[in-house]
């Protein structure tokens, strides 16, 4: 019988509240032996894959997804999933990225250091889940770079 894969975790460095134009890195973690990590966004079919997987500890592997210059269009919920042959994992919890204006006054929230998805699962917009795996080795040239208007 195939093993049950542990759910991945997701975190953001330097945090989940990022000034406009600054960088953020999403860190996806899973067990050793992961071939592909994928970063997804809620209610979208688009994703970003990487096979650049490093060993974070003797029992854990990780991948990093960097956005060099954050825009308002990058705000929203992100989650991770991974492929450990021959199976895809379940998705991680969602992690919400907030983008703040750089000119914010004293009431502006500070960047939250080392934020990660908590134990509570973010509800999806209906009973169905969205996104996930496609073929192996797809590389995105950019990470969700454009603005969205809802």
């Amino acid at each position: 019988q195939e093993e049950d894969l542990p759910r991945p975790s997701i975190s953001a460095e330097p945090g989940t509240v990022i000034p406009l134009g600054s960088h953020v890195t999403f860190v996806c973690r899973g067990p050793v032996g992961v071939q592909t990590f994928r970063l997804e966004r809620e209610s979208r079919s688009t994703y970003n894959d990487t096979e650049d997987v490093s060993q974070a500890s003797p029992s854990e592997s990780e991948a990093r997804f960097r956005i060099d210059s954050v825009s308002e269009g990058n705000a929203g919920p992100y989650r991770c999933i991974y492929y450990k042959p021959p199976k895809w994992s379940e998705q991680s919890d969602y992690l919400e990225l907030l983008v703040k204006e750089t000119s914010g006054g004293p009431d502006s929230p500070d960047t939250e250091p080392g934020s990660s998805a908590g134990p509570t699962q973010r509800p999806s917009d209906n009973s169905h889940n969205e996104h996930a795996p496609a073929s192996q080795g797809l590389k995105a040239e950019h990470l969700y770079h454009h603005h969205h208007h809802h």
Partner: antibody, heavy 117, light 110 residues
Amino acid sequence: EQSVESGGGLITPGGTLTLTCTASGFTVTRYYMNWVRQAPGKGLEWIGYIYASSKTYYANWAKGRFTISKTSTTVDLKMTSLTAEDTGTYFCARGGVGNSGLNLDLWGPGTLVTISS
Amino acid sequence: ELDMTQTPASVSEPVGGTVTIKCQASQSIGSWLAWYQQKPGQPPKLLIYQASRLASGVSSRFGGSGSGTEFTLTISDLECADAATYYCQQAEYSGDVENTFGGGTEVVVK
């Protein structure tokens, strides 16, 4: 690599029908597997897709009446409470090229479903 | 709710001519747009993805452009074999959509 739909045919209104998409040359669990339909002489209509550990997503109009499921080599589309408006050709299509599950690069030939009394 | 509007519904051009088809999204989809070609009795064929990238094996006579909400498919040096119906499809959102495809454009080659 190819996919082939089966299970179409003549069904009476109110009935239930399950279509099957059989893949060869690739593993459906590694891809977004979409169902798309086309009424006679009309345009393409996206139904939904399945991926990973049986995660699904559906068009608004398909929620509740259509269910997509899979095994390691097949993807099923179960349709309930069928009406004449559901008549058409049903396609299974593989998504995932270019980092989107909705970029459909491999299509089956389709299977015709006719709802009539 | 995201909707895709495609124009014109039909266009006729002579062999060697150029056809331009437009697709409009009701909200920004960045460059996440695909174009398909469908001939009678056949399944659709992916032509272009990410607004301007040619799918494998597709002739360079097909070109895509645009971003945000406005997109264009251009078929240059028309051939008889290009007679088909062409569909755009938003390839980003899977939540709160009625249909990911535009209504289609029939291309007649004279």
